[in-house]
């Protein structure tokens, strides 16, 4: 339950956070769709992957993503009033050796091939305080979330806590 002013307050803590252990606490395959039920799909084009947000035809199969969940411990804030904060972070891999990355300079979400240990750009803080939807906040750029812009995934700066409920940064996870 960590909205925008909380995110900004935790800028330092997010950057300082370390993934506890190299193993995820859990992993599973799920299809990713937007709040408005458009599917996130991945297509190999010219030896690189493109990410699309689109309506699927009735019997078209949804692409699956491997979600790997990690715990991240960060120091408690400047007030020094006790327990460290435990965050839940996620990496998203639609195909072997490729992971979603935040490109903060271009405000884009890209698929990069890389080996473990994964770079920080591949980690997203998971938010699920909006009923059964989730949001993905960049570990490398607190207050910036994966969102939908012009039928593509993009990085979207969220500047007030109310905007955490904005539909374009909310996603649904489904096993079907």
């Amino acid at each position: 339950a960590f909205g925008i002013s909380g995110v900004q307050k935790y800028t330092r803590a997010l950057h300082d956070s370390s993934i506890t252990g190299i193993s995820p606490i859990t992993e599973y395959l799920a299809s990713l769709s937007t709040y408005n039920d458009q599917s996130i799909t991945f297509a190999l084009e010219d030896e690189s992957y493109e990410i699309y947000v689109e309506d699927l035809k009735k019997d078209e199969k949804k692409d699956k993503v491997l979600l790997s969940y990690y715990e991240s411990q960060h120091p408690s804030n400047e007030s020094g009033d006790g327990v460290d904060g435990k965050m839940l972070m996620v990496t998203l891999s639609p195909t072997k050796d490729f992971w979603l990355h935040a490109n903060n300079k271009e405000h884009s979400v890209e698929l990069h091939k890389c080996e473990k240990p994964l770079p920080d750009q591949a980690f997203f803080v998971l938010h699920n305080m909006h009923s059964n939807c989730v949001s993905f906040e960049c570990k490398t750029d607190p207050g910036v979330f994966i969102g939908v812009k012009d039928n593509h995934l993009a990085l979207i700066k969220v500047d007030s806590s109310e905007n955490l409920c904005t539909e374009n940064i909310l996603f649904k996870l489904s096993e079907t």
Epitope: A1, F2, G3, V83, G85, V125, N128, E175
Partner: antibody
């Protein structure tokens, strides 16, 4: 260490109101989602309500929707539950609980208060 | 809402016994399941989260397993302080829901 201390319980007649409080210490209060969970005497646990870190998101169990209001005062490190139009079936021990993770309730509730008893009876 | 069921509803065991409690969800909840221990007059205490992660400070004789709809809590060697009621809770879909509890008492 983390402490959550509830207060405000008591005996109340059906249709009346009661306000519960939960005073928190030992963690960064303003960064966590908080919950109310209740337990009827000799029975199991029932989740009642959730409030996000800054109070902008609130969710309720169907059984209390429209009657109960969850709120928080981050300057006082205190969580509240305003209970209106109380019914005999609301009789229970009420616990406040903290989410394990800062941004998610996937991990369950890692710290609980000792509970405060609410009895609704004429 | 997702319904959670537990079995058995109660179990009598002796110190040193291996005790297994099962929890079933009415639909898939991935690995988002927590287990709590509650003693009379006390608040619940988180033992296991994410189906198999041991909460800090909890003895290693407690372990959890499972994913999807079927989950297990195992106490490898029951200790006197383990006699209590155990609840599972799904944390995957809103609203969070609890199982009815399993009471572990002295044989």
């Amino acid at each position: 260490q983390v402490q959550l201390v509830e207060s405000g319980g008591g005996v109340v007649q059906p249709g009346r109101s009661l306000r519960l409080s939960c005073a928190a210490s030992g963690f960064t209060f303003s960064s966590y989602g908080l919950h109310w969970v209740r337990q009827s005497p000799g029975k199991g646990l029932e989740w009642v309500a959730l409030i996000s870190y800054d109070g902008s998101n609130k969710y309720y169990a169907d059984s209390v929707k429209g009657r109960f209001t969850i709120s928080r005062d981050n300057s006082k490190n205190t969580l509240y539950l305003q209970m209106n139009s109380l019914r005999p079936e609301d009789t229970a021990g009420y616990f406040c609980a903290k989410s394990l993770y800062t941004t998610s309730w996937y991990g369950g509730f890692d710290y609980w208060g000792q509970g405060t008893l609410v009895t609704v009876s004429s | 809402d997702i319904q959670m069921t537990q079995s058995p509803s109660s179990v009598s065991a002796s110190v040193g016994d291996r005790v297994t409690i099962t929890c079933r969800a009415s639909q898939g909840i991935r690995s988002w399941l927590a287990w709590y221990q509650q003693k009379p007059g006390k608040a619940p205490n988180l033992l296991i989260y994410a189906a198999s992660s041991l909460q800090s400070g909890v003895p290693s004789r407690f372990s959890g397993s499972g994913s999807g709809t079927d989950f297990t809590l195992t106490i490898s060697s029951l200790q006197p302080e383990d006699f209590a009621t155990y609840y599972c809770q799904q944390a995957n879909s809103f609203p969070p829901t609890f199982g009815p509890g399993t009471k572990v008492d002295i044989k």
